[in-house]
């Protein structure tokens, strides 16, 4: 079993602590909480991603952290397993890969971490508010499910109701605190040369004393100005679900996978590379991000365009465990 | 203030299965983890699962007794958090609270929703 204090050199971003600022004495105790409690938990990550370039396409990965050998991966939408899920493919380490419509291609990415992309129109083709889940059977640890779906921010083109979203992201605050101190500086340079214009010029004279120039003071927004801030997330249509695919389900024994060829079963040692979206560049917030990082206990995310997300063949680790009883 | 609602709990035949949702209200701006605990009588509330979302990437984490039967999911739009239960056995019976925890720490509990399985 592993415990979470392991954690890799990079993550996928996790949420900035932006509510820790003041709490720097409650955020230890939860850091520590969270590894006693969480050690010997295995955690599963999904990721979800609606290619920009065409909207009905997919990309989901999986990956699970936990010291046990994988013996088998189950993708699945519409829902976990046992609750009307669709199969959409199965990745076993040495009898290949299985997969059907609108997969397009499933694949290793790690050891622990599979790939797969989706596209399709019309009836089976995937959309914005569509769960997609995915269940690791190891050994000895047994088997583990988890689903994910798109952000809601990821959604285009759908109606924003004026309803806060569930989370007022690190990067938003960021751009607002410096839009606001921009925006503090200019009035107080407009203040100052209004009085500068009214005021009579003044004589020259030798002062022994130079008068201290006025420091505009930066401001970062409040608890309560983020509070009040409303970021619209967009609505989600529920009419959509997945086309049951219930023939193409592997109802047999192991004998589907004999028509695989062998190299399907090839697993990667070490990470692959995932650069089909760059990272953005998270520009001068980045040091204030790290920052609460720093103060919980965690490694800060990525911090520039040019990284690999996962050079640790394990995939993602979160550091932040379960729920800790107060 | 946040208000935690369970509901979904009752009473099943070992074997069987149930779905606990979980709907959060109130000020949920900052929140980041939802999870399910569960108390069954004369024990201490123990944990079942969390789910946190980052981005677009979703972590989900289980106790060790869950060993697969249960799946734990979520729809972060909407504020709501499942708990699948399948293959429920008798030790399975407790009351199953739903809880979220905000980015400053801050703890809130829902009033339960009572899960019976009978063998």
């Known amino acids: 079993m592993r415990t979470e204090a392991q954690v890799p050199a990079l993550q996928p971003p996790e949420p900035g602590l932006e509510g820790a600022m003041g709490h720097r004495t409650l955020v230890l105790p939860w850091v520590l909480l969270t590894l006693c409690v969480t050690a010997g938990t295995p955690e599963v990550w999904v990721q979800v991603r609606m290619e920009a370039t065409e909207l009905s396409s997919f990309t989901i990965r999986c990956g699970f952290l936990g010291s046990g050998s994988i013996s088998l991966v189950t993708v699945s939408w519409g829902g976990p397993n046992g609750a009307g899920g669709t199969t959409l493919a199965v990745l076993h380490p040495e009898r290949g890969i299985r997969q059907w419509a609108p997969a397009r291609q499933a694949r290793w990415e790690t050891q622990s971490s599979i790939s797969l992309i989706l596209e399709g129109s019309g009836a089976s083709s995937p959309c914005a508010n569509t769960t997609f889940c995915c269940k690791f059977a190891s050994f000895p640890e047994g088997s583990w499910e988890a689903c994910g779906s798109l952000p809601p921010s990821s959604d285009p083109g759908l109606s924003a109701p004026p309803t806060p979203a569930p989370i007022l992201r690190a990067d938003l605050a960021g751009i607002l605190g410096v839009s606001g101190v921009l925006l503090f500086g200019c009035v107080y340079l407009l203040h100052l040369l209004r009085r500068h214009k009214h005021r009579p010029a003044p004589r020259l004279q030798p002062s022994r004393t130079s008068p201290q120039a006025p420091r505009a003071r930066a401001w970062a927004p409040s608890q309560a100005s983020q509070a009040a801030l409303h970021v619209p997330y967009a609505t989600i249509n529920t009419s959509c679900r997945p086309a049951t695919l219930d023939t193409a389900h592997p109802h047999g024994g192991p004998s589907w996978w004999a028509s695989l060829p062998t190299h399907a079963a090839h697993r990667p040692q070490g990470p692959a590379a995932w650069a089909s979206t760059p990272i953005p560049a998270r520009g001068s917030f980045v040091s204030v991000e790290n920052g609460l990082y720093a103060q919980a206990g965690e490694r800060p995310p990525h911090t520039g365009p040019g990284l690999t997300l996962f050079p640790d063949p394990r995939g993602p680790r979160a550091m932040e465990g379960p729920l800790g009883v107060r | 203030q946040v208000q935690l609602v369970e509901s979904g709990g009752g009473l099943v035949q070992s074997g069987g299965s149930l779905r606990l949702s979980c709907a959060a209200s109130?000020?949920?701006?900052?929140?980041?983890?939802m999870g399910w605990f569960r108390q069954a009588p004369g024990k201490e509330r123990e944990f079942v699962g969390r789910?946190?979302?980052?981005?677009?990437?979703?972590?989900?984490s289980y106790a060790d007794f869950v060993k697969g039967r249960f799946t734990l999911y979520g729809n972060q739009a909407r504020n709501t958090v499942y708990l699948q239960m399948n293959s429920l056995k008798p030790e399975d019976a407790a009351v199953y609270y739903c809880?979220?925890?905000?980015?400053?720490?801050?703890?809130?509990w829902g009033k339960g929703t009572l899960v019976t399985v009978s063998s």
């Open positions: 809880n979220l925890r905000r980015l400053d720490g801050v703890n809130y």
């Open positions: 789910i946190k979302w980052s981005g677009d990437t979703t972590y989900t």
């Open positions: 109130g000020r949920t701006r900052s929140m980041y983890v």
